[in-house]
Interface confidence: medium
């Protein structure tokens, strides 16, 4: 028994010599058809949903998953180089919005609110949603009407 | 294996402009985002900016915001590197490098385009 | 200006090890990989580790890479004389929303 656990214990580090538990030990895995970027897991839904029903999926989803936040340009721009390889077009719900409906967004994941992406006129009216706009590649957001019916992103930490 | 051929040796007066130019042989950039950094006599490498192939965006380090353009024609598979307001210290090696994604490493380089400027 | 820092030389015989090192801050190598490069002046430079340990098919396994919070390292083991070149540390830094060299270390095989 102890030469079996030992043989194991030998195999496993030399499969992290060669690099092949490298990626595993840093890299967790995301659910199937996710994406990993910087210790999250995305995922990109191309179903029709209002904002606080896409919420409600992501959640479905487990592993504390949410509408997803994005806190930094390499993260916006990684996520929107990889949407874009499947469509350029349709805008795409994300994690922030205006609960109190007083211009004070939030991240529905608990994050800071310090990153900014807007694109220019992107306030005002009934738009308390926000949304990745297809009109710069994905890369800047625009608030919307929360009730309308569009894509979504879903992210949570392995 | 993709090879990146880079245009020829360059020499600029102060205040003049110059466009570089990266070619994917062997390869195509459609998935890949090419990176430009250059390299003073004397010093280290610098990095400049990026364009993502597939989206056309760029990204620029903020040293070099406003002053440089990166632009790409994916009917050619050519990436351009446009310096404006040349100073003497632009006199350098200017190399493209490949990423499979963006900000990811740089696996494949160019052999570089040396820039003089001089009056 | 880098925010990498690496010594500007180092130096070992035929067979001996020699360890570059790379430090950086929270905003780089505290918070993403490295990668280093072998720059021989007059060529292209070359990848010999990306995300701070992987090595690329092709690079011998003389050449290992380690982080440890805000700074790496690259270890040539076995070095020889076709090891003379600079070494590059680089890693994306958040704070600058782009990538950073280090000011690059000059490998000389006595």
């Known amino acids: 028994m102890a030469s079996r656990s030992m043989r194991l214990l030998l195999l496993l580090s030399c499969l992290a010599k060669t690099g092949v538990l490298g990626d595993i030990i840093m890299r967790p895995s995301c659910a199937p058809g996710w994406f990993y970027h910087k210790s999250n897991c995305y995922g990109y839904f191309r179903k029709l949903r209002n904002w606080s029903d896409a919420e409600l999926e992501c959640q479905s989803y487990g592993n504390g998953a949410h509408l997803a936040s994005i806190l930094s340009l390499k993260e916006a721009s990684t996520i929107a180089e990889y949407i874009s390889g499947y469509q350029r077009s349709q805008p795409i719900w994300i994690g922030l919005h205006d609960p109190q409906k007083r211009q004070q967004w939030q991240w529905i994941d608990g994050a800071m609110y310090l990153y900014r992406s807007w694109s220019g006129k992107s306030m005002g009216g009934n738009k308390h949603c926000a949304e990745m706009s297809s009109n710069n590649n994905f890369l800047t957001w625009s608030s919307n009407e929360c009730n309308k019916r569009q894509h979504f992103l879903c992210k949570y930490r392995p | 294996q993709m090879q990146l051929v880079q245009s020829g040796a360059e020499v600029k007066k102060p205040g003049s402009s110059v466009k570089v130019s990266c070619k994917a042989s062997?390869?195509?950039?459609?998935?890949?985002?090419i990176n430009w950094v250059r390299q003073a006599p004397g010093q280290g490498l610098e990095w400049m900016g990026v364009i993502i192939s597939n989206l056309g965006t760029p990204y620029y380090a903020q040293s070099f915001q406003g002053r440089v353009t990166i632009s790409a024609d994916k009917s050619t598979g050519t990436v351009y590197l446009d310096v404006s307001s040349l100073r003497s210290d632009d006199s350098a090696t200017y190399y493209c490098?490949?990423?499979?994604?963006?900000?990811?490493?740089?696996?494949?380089w160019g052999k570089g385009t040396l820039v003089t400027v001089s009056s | 200006q880098s925010v990498l820092t690496q010594p500007p030389s180092a130096s070992g015989a035929p067979g001996q090890r020699v360890v570059i090192s790379c430090s950086g801050s929270?905003?780089?190598?505290?918070?993403?990989?490295v990668n280093w490069y072998k720059h021989v002046p007059g060529e292209a430079p070359k990848l010999l580790i990306y995300s701070s340990t992987q090595r690329p098919s092709g690079v011998p396994g003389r050449f290992s890479g380690s982080t440890s919070g805000t700074s790496g390292s690259l270890t040539i083991s076995g070095l020889q004389s076709g090891d003379e070149a600079d070494y590059y540390c680089?890693?994306?830094?958040?704070?600058?929303?782009?990538?950073?060299f280090g000011t690059g270390t000059k490998l000389t095989v006595l």
């Open positions: 680089a890693a994306f830094d958040d704070s600058l929303n782009g990538f950073v």
């Open positions: 929270t905003s780089s190598i505290g918070s993403n990989t």
């Open positions: 062997g390869g195509t950039f459609s998935s890949s985002s």
């Open positions: 490098a490949r990423a499979r994604r963006l900000w990811q490493t740089f696996d494949i």
